[in-house]
Every structure is written in C-alpha cells, then in structure tokens.
Interface confidence: medium
C-alpha cells in the first residue's frame, strides 16, 4: 500500500522535518503550510487549522514562500540619477539601477544605494578603463603619437594623422595639422588632388624639457578654458 499523504497541519514523525513549502510551528508543534510569494501569514496554524494567508498590501511584497506576519515594504522610489529596472509588485521589491553615464558607487543587496556620475577625461588624456555599472572611468595620459581633444567618459587616445607636409605638429591634446599643397595636375577636368594622410601614425613633438627633472617622454597638457590653480605642464 502507498504511504498515506499527510495534510497540513500534521505532527511530523520524530526526527523528521516538514516537507517543502511547509514550516514547523513551535507553538502548535505541527507542520503547517507556508504562504506563497505575494502573500503573508494572516493567522498562524493551530493543531486543528492550517495557516491562513493573505495577499500583500500595496507597496509591500514577499519574494519567497514564507510565514511572516507582515509583508516587507518596497524600497523608496528611485532617485533622479537612477532608473527603475524592476517595479515593486506583491512578489518582488523595486530595483533601482544607475542611469546611463552614471555608475554605482555604493551598492546594496539588489540594485544601487548611491549613484555617481562617470568621470570624464580631459583633453590630453584618454579612457584607460571604461566605466561599468559598478566602477568609474580611469583616465591615462595620451602617449607620444596619440591625442585626445575632448572631455569625455568614453573617448580613447587616437593616433595622430601623418602628413606629407606638417603645418602644426600634433601633441597630446591636438591632432597634427597637414599643410595644404598646391593642386597637382588633374586627372580629369575639374578634379583637384587634396593632400591625404598617408598613414595613421605621426611623429610626436616634445615640449622643451625642464632642466634636471624631464623624463624621457613629456606631454603637452592643455590649459583649457579654466586652467587649474597650479601650472599644468608635463615635466
């Protein structure tokens, strides 16, 4: 004969545990039903009656099978620097994540407690490591032969163009400028040959090194519209 199925509430066999989605009630000393996600225990079980469950009220939730007397409160509304990626329902908490251009500086169990804007690299510097959901942008100085002329949280250092004839050499914050040569003989009527970059790399001009402290490679740092209080020059 098959084993008899016990209906809740029931007294468990000595040494055994309650089944899945049941809990042991210490007062009734019985195995009783848990409430499903989105519900909570309105009345606890007795020796003769099972748990009475009720739906969570607005702005509260339970995510797991449970026997809690009250549902959990959903988190506060997402702040202006966040977006709601999961709404508050009877079965799940609200989840706020940082909006584009921001990262999570202080996380919590789910979502983010504090968002911060991704930093931008100023001209002369490019992005060494892009920002992620949980980490800020890391900048690096543009190496010789490369430049960045933007203030950006995404732009990397790009190679200088190389010219047939250089008008203005490139530096860390500016691309090389090529000289416009006189038009050569046209292949077809009205056609004009404009100077083209011949490759994507260029020689990197160095600023005048300071005596005694100059490293082997220097960078020209831009002074920008509002220069810092301290001098901004590469060695």
């Amino acid at each position: 004969l098959p084993a008899q199925v016990a209906f809740t509430p029931y007294a468990p066999e000595p040494g055994s545990t309650c089944r899945l989605r049941e809990y042991y009630d210490q007062t009734a000393q019985m195995c009783c039903s848990k409430c499903s996600p989105g519900q909570h225990a309105k009345v606890f079980c007795t020796k003769t009656s099972d748990t009475v469950c009720d739906s969570c009220e607005d702005s509260t939730y339970t995510q797991l099978w449970n026997w809690v007397p009250e549902c959990l409160s959903c988190g506060s509304r997402c702040s202006s620097d966040q977006v709601e990626t999961q709404a508050c329902t009877r079965e799940q908490n609200r989840i706020c994540t940082c909006r584009p251009g921001w990262y999570c500086a202080l996380s919590k169990q789910e979502g983010c407690r504090l968002c911060a804007p991704l930093r931008k690299c100023r001209p002369g510097f490019g992005v060494a490591r892009p920002g992620t959901e949980t980490s800020d942008v890391v900048c690096k100085p543009c190496a010789p032969g490369t430049f960045s002329n933007t203030t950006s949280s995404t732009d990397i250092c790009r190679p200088h163009q190389i010219c047939n004839v250089v008008a203005i050499p490139g530096n860390a914050s500016m691309d090389a400028v090529c000289t416009s040569t006189s038009p050569t003989r046209s292949m077809a009527p009205g056609a004009v040959h404009l100077p083209q970059p011949v490759s994507t790399r260029s020689q990197h001009t160095q600023p005048t090194p300071e005596p005694s402290t100059a490293p082997s490679t220097s960078f020209l740092l831009p002074m920008g519209p509002s220069p810092p209080a301290e001098g901004s020059t590469g060695d």
Partner: nanobody, 126 residues
Framework: QVQLVESGGGSVQAGGSLRLSCAAS????????MGWFRQAPGKEREGVAA????????YYADSVKGRFTISQDKAKNTLYLVMNNLKPDDTGVYYC???????????????????WGQGTQVTVSS
Amino acid sequence: QVQLVESGGGSVQAGGSLRLSCAASGHTYRSNCMGWFRQAPGKEREGVAAMYTGTDWKYYADSVKGRFTISQDKAKNTLYLVMNNLKPDDTGVYYCAADFGFICGYDSDDDPYDAWGQGTQVTVSS
C-alpha cells in the same frame, strides 16, 4: 578601495629637505595615477605632483618645479615625494591621493569616491 598612509613629515628650516612616503594597500591595481596634494592653513587644497605608473608622464605644480621630485617603488606599492630647498610657503598638510582629479587627467576635482590618505604635516620655518 585603496588605503593610503603617509609618513615622513616634520619640521625643517628653510632650505632643508624632507622625503614623504605613501604606502598603498587594497585595490592598488585601479590606481594608475598617484599624486601629492597639500593644504596650507586657510587655503584650498592644491595639486603638487603626480605620476602615471608605467609611463614617463609626470606633473609638477609651477611652485615646486626643480625642487620636488615624485617617484614610485612599484614593488613596495609606495609613492615618494622628495622635497629639496624647502620654503616657508611649502608649509601645510601633505596628502597622498590615488587616481584623483584634474592633475590625473579628470575634468574636475570633486569626486568623493577616490582614495586619500590622512595627511602628514610639513612645517618650514625661516
């Protein structure tokens, strides 16, 4: 987060020298730029010197060029600032900072999430 501890401050006569050290621990891989800032009484904090690990790029404020030298011992995760020919104007609290602000290439200095040391006092008397 990177933890930074400065040492080497003290009192010195004008024209004297000091060497500041900054020991870094924690997620030091994040900090490809390390720098020194100082704050004199009643003044704003100012960037003094900075360097990028793995490059020859270095930065010095105009007021310290030719007198201060920034260097790093990568094996010991330690940043140094050798200060020669000190002047009374160099007096202040010197802070070590990781991957921070304008002198490290960022567009502003107002980032509260970067690492700062607790500072070491430097006093230069005439």
